[in-house]
């Protein structure tokens, strides 16, 4: 039975040209995290494998940095980066947990961080 929950940074906004940290946290389970995948829509951004470490998709090396922790840093943001991002936690024995973050990249300087929320 999957008892865990994923806490994410929720709906967030950031300025064009700036950086943002995407963070997820898996709680309420003793399952072992074997791998975390970060996706933008259906595109792979990065993988953090418990045994092998980070793999950054070659398509995104110029704009993605690993961490902090299991999170991911997006740099040099453009308005095209607006959209859904997913952290996919592969765990044993529970299976897969998925968290969703919506990022809005703004032209103006009034970008504010949204509230944190949980996805069961």
């Amino acid at each position: 039975m999957m008892t865990g929950t994923i806490e994410t940074t929720g709906n967030i906004s950031a300025e064009k040209g700036g950086s943002i940290i995407l963070q997820c946290h898996l709680s309420s389970t003793t399952a072992q995290v074997t791998q975390v995948n970060w996706e933008q829509q259906d595109q792979l951004l990065a993988i953090c494998n418990a045994d092998l470490g980070w793999h950054i998709s070659p398509s995104f090396k110029d704009r993605v940095a690993p961490g902090p922790g299991l999170g991911l840093t997006l740099q040099s943001l453009t308005v095209n980066d607006t959209g859904e991002y997913f952290c996919i936690y592969h765990t044993y024995p529970d299976g897969t947990y998925t968290g969703r973050i919506f990022l809005e990249v703004l032209e103006s300087s009034v970008a504010e961080h949204g509230a944190r929320f949980q996805i069961p």
């Epitope: 792979l44 993988i47 470490g53 950054i56 070659p58 398509s59 090396k61 110029d62 940095a65 690993p66």
Partner: antibody
Framework: QVQLQQSGTELVRPGTSVKMSCRTA????????IHWVKQRPGHGLEWIGD????????NYNEKFRGKATLTADTSSSTAYMELSSLTSEDSAIYYC??????????WGQGTSVTVSS | DIVMSQSPSSLAVSVGEKVTVNCKSS????????????LAWFQQKPGQSPKLLIY???TRESGVPDRFTGSGSGTDFTLTISSVKAEDLAVYYC?????????FGSGTKLEIK
């Protein structure tokens, strides 16, 4: 020990398709990418694309998009590449190789494909 | 696409001599986050598949003799064989794996006099 065993030599007709395999052993198949590389005499090494058996991810060199199709079967730890609409330009040795982040560290022995009528 | 320019295309040396192979990338291969250059060197002996010698520009693969050394960062890279042995007869390729599509140099054929 890590092994990548590729299927045998193929002699095929122009216009047909061929599907070759890359059977792996000695490591966790779903943790590593499998890359495919083409080698023709006098043309060096050409990267075709890669597939990540632990997810639904694959990437193609635009030059081979529509020509090559990469798949993987996790139950048998085997990767496959199908080449379609074959011409003499597709006559080559095709290699599979294992990759994570640091390099293509183990290679198969290659599959030779000859396209001839 | 990133173009890998490799030189020389061939060279003939005597056993015991030092060999230097150069590789120049059309784009920077240094990833700022880990300060590693995504450049590998492969050796391909006649009738065999390529074998990894060096990755991240300068890290020697396990089991590779220490006469093989990789150096360089960013766009300019070198493979050095400090004292060539007869068994080093092969074609040597550089490869970038910084960005898709991965690309190889055209190869350097090493012949033994």
């Amino acid at each position: 020990q890590v092994q990548l065993q590729q299927s045998g030599t193929e002699l095929v007709r122009p216009g047909t398709s061929v599907k070759m395999s890359c059977r792996t052993a000695g490591y966790t198949f779903t943790n590593y990418w499998i890359h495919w590389v083409k080698q023709r005499p006098g043309h060096g090494l050409e990267w075709i694309g890669d597939i990540y058996p632990g997810g639904r991810y694959s990437n193609y060199n635009e030059k081979f998009r529509g020509k090559a199709t990469l798949t993987a079967d996790t139950s048998s730890s085997t990767a496959y590449m199908e080449l379609s609409s074959l011409t003499s330009e597709d006559s080559a040795i095709y290699y599979c190789a294992r990759y994570y982040e640091s390099a293509m560290d183990f290679w198969g022995q290659g599959t030779s494909v000859t396209v001839s009528s | 696409d990133i173009v890998m320019s490799q030189s020389p295309s061939s060279l003939a040396v005597s056993v015991g001599e030092k060999v230097t192979v150069n590789c120049k990338s059309s784009q920077n291969l240094l990833y700022n986050s880990n300060q590693k250059s995504y450049l590998a060197w492969f050796q391909q002996k006649p009738g065999q598949s390529p074998k990894l010698l060096i990755y991240w520009a300068s890290t020697r693969e396990s089991g590779v003799p220490d006469r093989f050394t990789g150096s360089g960062s960013g766009t300019d890279f070198t493979l050095t064989i400090s004292s060539v042995k007869a068994e080093d007869l092969a074609v040597y390729y550089c490869q970038q794996y910084y960005n898709y599509p991965f690309t190889f140099g055209s190869g350097t054929k090493l012949e033994i006099k």
